[in-house]
């Protein structure tokens, strides 16, 4: 009996430019003889329904149709037919199919590969055209993929134990597509500093599929206005 097992859940997520290994494990009732077996990897793009050969291995012959694609012959002996793709790009997302032939048997498995790019975030103060005691803070997130992103603003006052989400005076612009396929977006918070308590910490919070934990950029409102400062335990991305 010949079986192929891919990534559990049927989806693999990898960061842009990473050297990705797409998993494919072979289960066979006898020891594998790599000289008498074949492995072919196929790729089907997200945008058009056509399957393309990426890599093939037959006995003493192997060929990479995608530059740098490799299946390790040493790992293959122990049943690991995983495909390694260096420097993965956004357009290489899609369905990958691992086809294994141990004559006369054939088995295959498919996995969806998602390529993501993490946003970089920075905080800017824009005072141009603002009234007295009014400040506009801009949180720029750039270089992310896919397009879906969630940017919120929170404040943490001195007295209350938990942050408060700010919904008023927040404008998040449209996402802009970059030449490389990634996206940028800017969210603005308008503050009337005369109505806020000094010592209040404000955060731009960016949530994206590529991030395990949200990306946070902070500033603290001080008695002397307009001071962007790094606060305890914060990541500063300016």
């Amino acid at each position: 009996d010949l079986k192929v097992e891919m990534m559990a859940g049927g989806t693999q997520i990898t960061p842009l430019n990473d050297n990705v290994t797409i998993f494919c494990n072979i289960f066979y009732s006898q020891p594998l003889n790599i000289t008498s077996m074949g492995i072919t990897w196929f790729w089907k793009s997200l945008t058009f329904d056509k399957e393309v050969k990426v890599f093939e291995f037959f006995g003493d012959h192997q060929e990479a149709f995608r530059p740098g694609a490799i299946v390790s012959p040493w790992r293959l002996k122990s049943g690991d037919a995983s495909l390694r793709l260096p420097g993965i790009q956004l357009e290489e997302a899609g369905e990958y199919r691992c086809e294994v032939v141990v004559t006369p048997l054939k088995a295959q498995g498919t996995v969806q590969l998602e390529v993501v790019a993490s946003p970089a975030s920075r905080l800017l103060l824009d005072q141009v055209g603002m009234k007295e005691n009014e400040d506009k803070y801009m949180c720029e997130s750039s270089g992310f993929y896919p397009e879906a992103i969630n940017i919120t603003w929170e404040k943490q006052t001195q007295k209350f134990p938990h942050p408060i989400e700010i919904s008023e005076d927040v404008i998040t612009g449209p996402t802009i597509k970059n030449m490389d396929g990634t996206f940028n977006v800017t969210s603005c918070l308008k503050l009337n500093s005369s109505q806020e308590d000094p010592g209040t910490v404000y955060q731009c919070v960016v949530r994206h599929a590529s991030l395990h934990t949200p990306l946070r950029s902070n500033f603290t409102l001080t008695a002397a206005r307009h001071s962007l400062s790094e606060t305890e335990k914060t990541d500063n991305f300016s």
Epitope: E154, Q156, Q158, K159, F160, P161, H162, P163, I164, E165, G199, V201, Q203, V205, P214, R216, T231, E232, K233, T234
Partner: antibody
Framework: QVQLVQSGAEVKKPGASVKVSCKAS????????MNWMKQAPGQGLEWIGG????????DYNEKFKGKVTMTVDTSTSTVYMELSSLRSEDTAVYYC??????????WGQGTLVTVSS | DIQMTQSPSSLSASVGDRVTITCKAS??????VAWYQQKPGKAPKSLIY???NRYDGVPSRFSGSGSGTDFTLTISSLQPEDFATYFC?????????FGAGTKLEIK
């Protein structure tokens, strides 16, 4: 990292007073507000009151006014909560807590105060 | 003072179950609600703030929802370490007030 270390367990007789301490480290002490919570055995949580650590202001739950006094020693980064005229219903674990940022608020390990004759 | 009424007071469930705990405020508290988990002999640990935002490091199986007066904490698939007591808290105004707690036990 932020740490709130409270004083050890206390056993007091009814009518006595007790002073519980909470020593803070790992952050700029005076720029925060410290709350105190009470948790009686097997019960829920109650907010007792809070103190701004620069010592400027306190805010007590009406229920605890006259029972509790909060003070600060900025030189040692320590907050104190004194409970007076102790009764059996004051038997509880007392926690000092400080607002957090994005990992949640910080709590001391708790101090058990037992009032028993 | 704002009362926070939590239900149920206790709940038996099995690993893998989906569990929902509710909290009702006596007046509108907006989204100013936090949820805590407490294990015996330990200080409470905050899970959720602003009704639905998970603190960093809190597993995604924990989620909060609601606004105004009705709030819920949901654990999508119970893990052995989730058996504990859960409290809601309003922080729109002082005095801060808590629900009486929900003790989550193994069935």
């Amino acid at each position: 990292q932020v740490q709130l270390v409270q004083s050890g367990a206390e056993v007091k007789k009814p009518g006595a007073s007790v002073k519980v301490s909470c020593k803070a480290s790992g952050y700029t002490f005076t720029s925060y507000w410290m709350n105190w919570m009470k948790q009686a055995p097997g019960q829920g949580l109650e907010w007792i009151g809070g103190i701004y650590l620069s010592g400027e202001s306190t805010d007590y739950n009406e229920k605890f006014k006259g029972k509790v006094t909060m003070t600060v020693d900025t030189s040692t980064s320590t907050v104190y909560m004194e409970l007076s005229s102790l009764r059996s219903e004051d038997t509880a674990v007392y926690y000092c807590t400080r607002r957090g940022d994005y990992f949640g608020d910080f709590w001391g390990q708790g101090t058990l105060v037992t009032v028993s004759s | 003072d704002i009362q926070m009424t939590q239900s149920p007071s206790s709940l038996s469930a099995s690993v893998g179950d989906r569990v929902t705990i509710t909290c009702k405020a006596s007046q509108n508290v907006g989204k100013y609600v936090a949820w805590y988990q407490q294990k015996p002999g330990k200080a409470p640990k905050s899970l959720i703030y602003s009704a639905s935002n998970r603190y960093d490091g809190v597993p995604s199986r924990f989620s909060g929802s609601g606004s105004g007066t009705d709030f819920t904490l949901t654990i999508s698939s119970l893990q052995p370490e989730d058996f504990a007591t859960y409290f809601c808290q309003q922080y729109i105004s002082y005095p801060l007030t808590f629900g009486a707690g929900t003790k989550l036990e193994i069935k």
